[in-house]
């Protein structure tokens, strides 16, 4: 089941997920000046079985200037600078697809996307947040949102995180400032109260990446 | 919950233009497709276009391209679709739905086209 | 673009009994990206299906879809008094998105 809505918004922060559960849609949409070759997918579909999962259909950009021609353009390095998400993309996979069942990785980028990644979760998907740069976390709880499916809606969890600006003084006691920046691996990534099996995979997972999977742009 | 509200019916002269608005409240507005779809009286639904807000890049039908203008604010979370050039064949009802797979839809816009 | 045809164009069935409506797409669409909707009269489209068998929220479990590649089936088990209405099949897996031509469910 789709999840409604997108999770919830925190200011000064970005949202990633560490995988994919199968049933998650990415929109395939590119950047000014380029469209989807014609009859084209829509939609990636994360899709498998108990032992593989993987990404169905292929995004697919080509010139708008050029008609039936599927020739594509390879991105200057200043134009690849420019694609940011809302969400945190990483362009290497921290994770070993088999080892989350049922569970895609982050698809690797095509050639003239778009700014922006749309996803479509579904039920059971687990985000993690972060302060975005220039910014840091006041944890109150879990830094993270699960869909859940509840009274016949979808819903999402609301992740306890709060991020103020470097100037700012305020904060929790004992809390230090951080070292890298964007910000490391939220501390609360260990401390999931979910307790379906799927979220104690993925955060058990995510107690192990590395702080390097935040990076908020491809390189 | 999802609500997209739709501005009210028009009568328009032919070879004017009619702009439609679609307001959402209560979700994810900029970072999912706003389709316009039209019907036409006791005919099947017709899809125009869509758009993405927070991309601003709008898709359009090849029957309406050059005609069609579909845009957004994300300040105000509405969207817009104007058409051109109308003719009678333009009377219809026009629906803005969220999704490509119209998971809301606002309540329609009757555009009467007659001289 | 994929087309698609939806038949019959009218159903005349009894309430409580079983509705079965076919769309088929002149080509392949990809992943079961298919949505089935009803409409009645001065209303807009209600999504029912989506990805060719999930239920949308709230519909109840006596409209179910099934069907891949290019033949679809929305089936409506018992039909209810407010079930009667004109169903349509839409395909969402490449541009331009389609319509079939729809299906009128009406009371025999």
């Known amino acids: 089941e789709l999840c409604d809505d997108d999770p919830p918004e925190i200011p000064h922060a970005t949202f990633k997920a560490m995988a994919y559960k199968e049933g998650t849609m990415l929109n395939c949409e590119c950047k000014r000046g380029f469209r989807r070759i014609k009859s084209g997918s829509l939609y990636m579909l994360c899709t498998g079985n108990s032992s593989h999962s993987s990404w169905d259909n292929q995004c697919q950009c080509t010139s708008s200037a050029t008609r039936n021609t599927t020739k594509q353009v390879t991105p200057q390095p200043e134009e690849q600078k420019e694609r940011k998400t809302t969400e945190m993309q990483s362009p290497m996979q921290p994770v070993d697809q088999a080892s989350l069942p049922g569970h895609c990785r982050e698809p690797p980028p095509w050639e003239n996307e778009a700014t922006e990644r749309i996803y479509h979760f579904v039920v059971g998907q687990m985000v993690y947040y972060q302060c975005v740069q220039g910014y840091r976390a006041l944890h109150r709880g879990p830094a993270e949102s699960v869909c859940k499916m509840t009274h016949g809606k979808t819903r999402w969890t609301q992740p306890q995180l709060i991020c103020t600006g470097e100037m700012e003084t305020s904060q929790f006691p004992g809390e230090e400032k951080p070292q890298a920046s964007p910000e490391g691996r939220p501390e609360s990534e260990t401390s999931c109260l979910v307790t379906t099996t799927d979220f104690q995979i993925q955060t058990e997972m995510a107690a192990t990446m590395e702080t390097s999977i935040f990076t908020t742009e491809y390189q | 919950q999802v609500q997209l509200v739709q501005s009210g019916a028009e009568v328009k002269k032919p070879g004017s233009s009619v702009k439609v608005s679609c307001k959402a409240s209560?979700?994810?507005?900029?970072?999912?497709?706003i389709n316009w779809v039209r019907q036409a009286p006791g005919q099947g639904l017709e899809w125009m276009g869509r758009i993405i807000p927070i991309l601003g890049i709008a898709d359009y039908a090849q029957r309406f391209q050059g005609r069609v203008t579909i845009t957004a604010d994300k300040s105000t979370n509405t969207a817009y679709m104007e058409l051109s050039s109308l003719r009678s064949e333009d009377t219809a009802v026009y629906y803005c739905?969220?999704?490509?797979?119209?998971?809301?839809w606002g309540q329609g816009t009757l555009v009467t086209v007659s001289s | 673009e994929i087309v698609l045809t939806q038949s019959p164009g009218t159903l005349s069935l009894s309430p409580g009994e079983r509705a079965t409506l076919s769309c088929r797409a002149s080509?392949?669409?990809?992943?079961?990206?298919l949505a089935w909707y009803q409409q009645k009269p001065g209303q807009a489209p209600r999504l029912l299906i989506y990805g060719a068998s999930s239920r949308a929220t709230g519909i109840p479990d006596r409209f179910s879809g099934s069907g891949s590649g290019t033949d679809f089936t929305l089936t409506i088990s018992r039909l209810e008094p407010e079930d009667f209405a004109v169903y349509y099949c839409q395909q969402y897996s490449s541009s331009p998105l389609t319509f079939g031509g729809g299906t009128k469910v009406e009371i025999k």
């Open positions: 080509q392949s669409v990809s992943s079961s990206f």
């Open positions: 209560g979700g994810t507005f900029s970072r999912y497709p």
């Open positions: 739905a969220r999704r490509d797979w119209g998971d809301y």
